[in-house]
């Protein structure tokens, strides 16, 4: 007994086409490009029906339905616009992802098309939505302002500045991504096994301001080469935050140095350091203070400290900054903060040093502040961030 002649569904075709279909004969359905086989709402990759001995097909005809990529994924810190038409998500529809301007940016152009495989796809063939990365290194601060020898920061000057509070200690750090803080290893060493006891505040100028953005650490990563209590080589650490912070005018990461940045940190080039550490009066600063200081000659700095503290080594992983005449320096309580430089090409601020150690007499003549040389640790930083 023959089976009824199969009729191809709209936007589909049948193969093979026969004059008659009898027991065990079969046909397959193929859809036009941009259409997919659906049985109800469930997709099929292929469809073949077999003629049974009672003269019926063993399964009903599917539909060839236009591919629907569905609503595009939400974009954190951005949004999506429908270009083809309101809520149109079918084959060849176009959408445009955009990031919140000023504070976030994306590497691609953000244009995605609904392709025949049912995925929103970028012009580069990427199936995953773009990422809105935080903009880094924007600041209202300009070099030239006359912490020890410092002056108060204004809103937006150092939006990467982070206050790290322990039960009895205070230090600083620099936001380098929306969920990573760069700091000195010595500043967080005691907290490495109890990260949750570290209180992280950002978006503030006044140290005791009640209007801060709170962040909590998930994990602390101390550089493997750092030995606590035995010098300050590799005095660098990363704090991963439990949650991403929202970037705005008062909270923004500082950039990491580009390979070419070494040329911007030569002797006598000026950097800026900010903190709530001890001031000339020997008291912790109430307001965030900053000072513009020049990079010191490395050999001169090494010689000063060899004489001052025999056995204390100024390594190639450190850079020194300050005036021979003294008067401008970072001090206790500033530890972990960023020594930043303006990249003239990008007009962005990058972190060149981390406040590490120095003379007991902050700001003394011929006694420079010593900073961890961040450019030496870019591979370490990138490795930690990409793996965790």
């Amino acid at each position: 007994r023959p089976c009824p002649d199969p009729t191809a569904p709209p936007n589909g075709s049948i193969s093979p086409v026969q004059a008659i279909y009898v027991l065990k004969d079969r046909f397959s359905v193929f859809c036009k490009t941009g259409f997919e086989l659906l049985q109800g709402s469930v997709p099929l990759k292929s469809f073949t029906a077999v003629c049974q001995k009672d003269g019926s097909w063993d399964r009903p005809m599917p539909e060839c339905s236009i591919i629907d990529c569905g609503p595009p994924d939400d974009l954190p810190n951005g949004h999506v616009d429908y270009i083809t038409g309101p809520e149109v998500t079918t084959y060849k529809a176009v959408i445009q992802y955009s990031c919140e301007e000023t504070f976030y940016t994306m590497s691609s152009n953000g244009k995605y098309v609904c392709e025949a495989d049912g995925f929103w796809t970028s012009s580069k063939g990427e199936k995953l939505p773009p990422v809105c990365e935080p903009v880094c290194g924007l600041s209202t601060h300009t070099i030239g302002g006359q912490i020890v020898g410092g002056q108060p920061a204004k809103p937006g000057d150092f939006p990467w500045q982070v206050l790290l509070l322990g039960q009895t200690t205070a230090a600083a750090g620099a936001l380098i991504h929306d969920n990573w803080v760069l700091t000195a290893a010595h500043a967080v060493y005691e907290k490495r096994m109890a990260a949750s006891s570290l209180n992280i505040r950002m978006g503030i100028l006044k140290r005791l301001s009640p209007h801060y953005t709170q962040a909590w650490p998930e994990e602390i990563f101390i550089h493997e080469g750092y030995t606590h209590g035995a010098g300050f080589d590799n005095d660098i650490a990363l704090i991963k935050l439990k949650n991403k912070v929202t970037i705005n005018g008062s909270i923004m990461p500082v950039c990491l140095p580009r390979k070419e940045a070494a040329s911007l940190m030569r002797t006598d080039f000026t950097g800026t350091v900010a903190g709530w550490g001890l001031t000339q009066k020997g008291l912790l600063a109430r307001n965030l203070m900053f000072v513009d200081i020049p990079i010191a000659d490395h050999q001169k700095c090494t010689a000063v400290y060899e004489k001052l503290y025999p056995g204390v080594r100024v390594s190639a992983n450190m850079l020194c900054a300050g005036l021979e005449t003294g008067g401008k320096d970072s001090c206790r309580g500033d530890s972990g903060g960023a020594l930043v430089f303006l990249d003239n090409e990008t007009q962005r601020w990058f972190v060149g040093g981390i406040v590490s150690w120095g003379s007991i007499n902050c700001g003394a003549a011929d006694q420079y502040g010593v900073y961890t040389k961040v450019i030496n640790y870019i591979p370490w930083i990138e490795n930690i961030i990409s793996n965790f």
Partner: antibody, heavy 114, light 107 residues
Framework: QVQLQESGPGLVKPSETLSLTCTVS?????????WNWIRQPPGKKLEWMGY???????SYNPSLKSRITISRDTSKNQFSLKLSSVTAADTAVYYC???????WGQGTLVTVSS | EIVMTQSPATLSVSPGERATLSCKAS??????VAWYQQKPGQSPRALIY???YRYSGIPARFSGSGSGTEFTLTISSLQSEDFAVYFC?????????FGGGTKVEIK
């Protein structure tokens, strides 16, 4: 012979993430069909949670959309369920199945309790 | 979402008799309906797909019919192994949904 087998912890604490894996043997999950997660709270009816299709596209029950992720590992011929922020209401027997439902796993009871 | 309403909730039938189970969809689902049998402590077993197509290996005493919003599962002559809970299921539109079940018990 197509077989599906669910695996994962039987006890999950409230607010944590429930994670289950379905291992498929006798058929490649990329060959065809959609691959479902379905659950059944004690004494209640079946609830479709979502599927991942042969191409890797997913479709979720809107009632769970903010909490559910279905993914796959084609090298192991497995597909997985993650359900975040669970509560006692997520206590159920969890099944994986192949659409049209012709093959099901034996089910695994997941209890949400502290 | 499409609500699938099954009736009766419980059906008492003697072995050898016919059982007729009803399932109503809250909106048109075409013929995209499946029927499952479930016994205590077991996973569901697929009986019928596309409203009236029997899965291979399913005895001929099970038959399905209907389209649109009204569907029926008929067991022509109940065997002892048929006493179980039966669910209908629509896969016409997301979210896919199931009926509350009909328990077929021995009279």
């Amino acid at each position: 012979q197509v077989q599906l087998q669910e695996s994962g912890p039987g006890l999950v604490k409230p607010s944590e993430t429930l994670s289950l894996t379905c291992t498929v043997s006798g058929y490649s999950i990329t060959s065809d069909y959609a691959w479902n997660w379905i659950r059944q709270p004690p004494g209640k009816k079946l609830e479709w949670m979502g599927y991942i299709s042969y191409s890797g596209r997913t479709s979720y029950n809107p009632s769970l959309k903010s909490r559910i992720t279905i993914s796959r590992d084609t090298s192991k011929n497995q597909f997985s369920l993650k359900l975040s922020s669970v509560t006692a209401a997520d206590t159920a027997v969890y099944y994986c199945s192949r659409h049209y439902g012709d093959y099901w796993g034996q089910g695994t009871l997941v209890t949400v309790s502290s | 979402e499409i609500v699938m309403t099954q009736s009766p909730a419980t059906l008492s039938v003697s072995p050898g008799e016919r059982a007729t189970l009803s399932c109503k969809a809250s909106q048109n689902v075409g013929t995209n309906v499946a029927w499952y049998q479930q016994k205590p402590g077991q996973s569901p077993r697929a009986l019928i797909y596309s409203a009236s197509y029997r899965y291979s290996g399913i005895p001929a005493r099970f038959s399905g019919s209907g389209s649109g919003t009204e569907f029926t599962l008929t067991i022509s002559s109940l065997q002892s192994e048929d006493f179980a809970v039966y669910f209908c299921h629509q896969y016409n539109a997301n979210p896919l949904t199931f009926g509350g079940g009909t328990k077929v018990e021995i009279k």
